[in-house]
């Protein structure tokens, strides 16, 4: 999916209202400087296809991140704020089938959800230079 | 077996207003996404509200501030009451109800037409 079309002020606010709390909520007792961030993101679209890519993809050590809450959110978010989302996604999950997940905590969750607070934080500075 | 049940569809003018319901049963999930879609003849299927497990609510810019979604988990049903309706409100409802995450919207009402037109 393009994330070119987006609404990204919407989605911006989405999140600085409540996905960010959700994050804070999944990574408490855990310090900030725990993890170092090496994913990066070069534009708006950029960092929702990697926000996309990390939240829904499970990973070798990390299978369970899109049952959390604020998976929900970023997912009903993408959705409502970019344009045709809603039906490549329905087109791709009639075509696959149906995983159900438990939902574990494990370190590379807390890794992979502290590498997602920094996509979202340089999502929400687009005007920032890339260091 | 899992099924979504959704009513309250109609014909109204518009300005009046109508209360969608959908009844979920089979699920037992404490984690969800309960959303309302929409389909206009020739177009795609929209989301236009969403409301989580946690009580915290999406709505879409065209119906904000005119439709108000809610749930009631003890009776496993979700609301859509939409005010102020116009004839661009025209369209089937769907609700629909992600559950675990996996995938997108695991489970899908019927729908329900909504037509507004005087």
């Known amino acids: 999916y393009d994330f070119t079309n987006c609404d990204f002020e919407k989605i911006k606010a989405a999140y600085l209202s409540t996905i960010s709390k959700d994050l804070i909520t999944y990574m408490s007792g855990t310090k900030s400087t725990e993890f170092n961030n090496t994913v990066s993101c070069s534009n708006r679209p950029h960092c929702l296809t990697e926000i996309q890519s990390l939240t829904f993809n499970p990973t070798a050590g990390c299978a369970s991140l899109a049952k959390e809450m604020f998976a929900m959110k970023t997912k009903a978010a993408l959705a409502i704020w970019c344009p045709g989302y809603s039906e490549t996604q329905i087109n791709a999950t009639q075509a696959m089938k149906k995983r159900r997940k438990r939902k574990v905590t494990t370190n590379k969750c807390l890794e992979q959800v502290s590498q997602l607070q920094g996509l979202w934080r340089r999502f929400n500075r687009p005007l920032l230079k890339q260091q | 077996e899992v099924q979504l049940v959704e009513s309250g569809g109609g014909l109204v003018q518009p300005g009046g207003s109508l209360r969608l319901s959908c009844a979920a049963s089979?699920?037992?999930?404490?984690?969800?996404?309960m959303g309302w879609f929409r389909q206009a003849p020739g177009k795609e299927r929209e989301l236009v509200s969403a409301?989580?497990?946690?009580?915290?609510?999406l709505y879409a810019d065209s119906v904000k501030g005119r439709f108000t979604i809610s749930a009631d988990n003890s009776k496993n049903t979700a609301y859509l009451q939409m005010n102020s309706l116009k004839p661009e409100d025209t369209a089937v409802y769907y609700c629909?109800?992600?559950?675990?995450?996996?995938?997108?919207?695991?489970?899908w009402g019927q729908g329900t037409l909504v037509t507004v037109s005087s």
């Open positions: 409301i989580f497990s946690d009580g915290s609510t």
């Open positions: 089979g699920l037992t999930f404490s984690s969800y996404i």
């Open positions: 629909a109800r992600d559950d675990y995450g996996g995938n997108f919207f695991d489970y």
